[in-house]
């Protein structure tokens, strides 16, 4: 409630997060022309990436382009990229949609299609749909610990969301445990009215709002956070220009003294932690 006699001050905040959980991933692996089921374990180091600011990212799906080498090759025959003669290919041209620099030659991509030869990481990335269901759909059961320290410098008051009395094995629940700072990712989505399994395919952005409404007067002192959740990206994926949330990264290695890389297009959820509120004191 608004106490007009109080001097109000906006919150200054710092956030630190820790994600925990293990995912078992089953996917088709092709070796020597033979496709078989491959099983792999993903731990925190495999699916989380350090982000700047009050954000963390959890990979929920991916598309791999394995064994890429820097050389010449035909570019992927995306729409409008096919050619029938060298005239269509311009030496030195860097098409923003392409993955390399054209050599000026039109070469066979496969039995039926020709594309411009490019200097690039080869074979160039194919335009594949994100796997459905998501490969790391079990990320729904991962948990995140959010440490939030806040400060009101004008009132010389500092506190944090984690209290010494808190149980490390608790899980946030809006009704039963609203002060627990360990959140199950699936619960965050449920609270926001979203389907984790669906969002995990293409990725998305989820907001975790921490609201501090602090009464710092000694006779009626109260300063505890209130958590709420809402989706921040455009969820109408059919209508949005670039649906979901994804980025690419590479793992580099050497094979027979040749530098190679595995390109990974990672889809996942970026969680943005938004801390706001005021501290009031007479």
């Amino acid at each position: 409630s608004d106490k007009l006699y109080q001097r109000k001050e906006p919150v200054i905040s710092s956030v630190h997060t820790k994600v925990k959980g293990i995912a078992e991933v089953t996917e088709n692996v092709t070796e020597g022309g033979v496709t078989k089921l491959g099983h792999s374990i993903f731990d925190t180091a495999d699916y989380t990436f350090p982000l700047q600011g009050n954000s963390f990212f959890v990979m929920t799906n991916y598309v791999k382009s394995e064994g890429q080498v820097q050389t010449l090759c035909p570019e992927y025959p995306r729409r409008g990229a096919q050619c029938s003669s060298d005239r269509r290919c311009k030496k030195g041209w860097m098409d923003p949609q392409s993955k390399g620099i054209q050599t000026g030659r039109c070469v066979p991509y496969d039995k039926t299609r020709k594309t411009c030869e490019v200097s690039a990481w080869c074979p160039t990335e194919e335009e594949k749909e994100a796997p459905r269901p998501a490969l790391l759909r079990s990320a729904e059961n991962f948990t995140v610990l959010i440490k939030n320290n806040i400060h009101f410098p004008g009132h010389n008051y500092t506190t944090r969301n984690i209290l010494p009395t808190m149980n490390g094995s608790c899980t946030f629940h809006k009704t039963w445990d609203p002060q627990c700072s360990i959140f199950r990712l699936g619960d965050i989505f449920q609270e926001a009215g979203e389907n984790f399994t669906e969002v995990a395919v293409q990725g998305g952005i989820m907001g975790i709002e921490i609201y501090w409404d602090c009464n710092l007067d000694s006779w009626s002192h109260h300063c505890r956070p209130r958590y709420s959740f809402r989706r921040l990206d455009d969820k109408n994926t059919d209508e949005s220009f670039v649906p979901g949330y994804n980025f690419r990264y590479a793992k580099y290695y050497k094979e027979n003294n040749v530098e190679k890389r595995t390109l990974i297009k990672a889809f996942g959820i970026r969680f943005d932690i938004l801390v706001f509120g005021t501290g009031g004191k007479f």
Epitope: G67, Q68, V69, T71, L72, C73, P74, T103, R105, V107, P108, Y109, D110, K111, E117, C122, P123, N256, V258, K260
Partner: nanobody, 120 residues
């Protein structure tokens, strides 16, 4: 139909030479690789050629002894093998792929192979 046919194999004494041919039909290729497989061993990439610029790659064990060339008009590539050693004995085949250049066999052409035997 996409096809590759090898020829030129045979029996030769150590230090001798052979010239293998790989003729393509039914498609225009971009990269051709020569591979060999000795009994009880894995398939090994010997060399590759890129048709557009004629650049070649050779595995270390054949460098300086084998030469790959192409005849675009004839749709044929050649593997000139000199100073042959008994360890070069294998079935040699060509394919529209090159592992060294990360070029997968999207065209799907692969020959049946030709036997090369080097006696000591």
């Amino acid at each position: 139909e996409v096809q590759l046919v090898e020829s030129g194999g045979g029996l030769v004494q150590s230090g001798g030479s052979l010239r293998l041919s790989c003729a393509g039909s039914g498609f225009s290729y971009y990269i051709i690789g020569w591979f060999r497989q000795a009994p009880g061993k894995e398939r090994e990439e010997v060399s590759c050629i890129r048709v557009t610029d004629g650049s070649t790659y050779y595995t270390n064990s054949v460098k300086g002894r084998f030469t790959m060339s192409r005849d675009n008009a004839e749709n044929t590539v050649y593997l000139q093998m000199n100073s042959l050693k008994p360890e070069d004995t294998a079935v040699y085949s060509c394919a529209t792929e090159c592992q060294r250049w990360a070029y997968p066999n999207r065209i799907g052409a692969r020959g049946q192979g030709t036997q090369v035997t080097v006696s000591s």
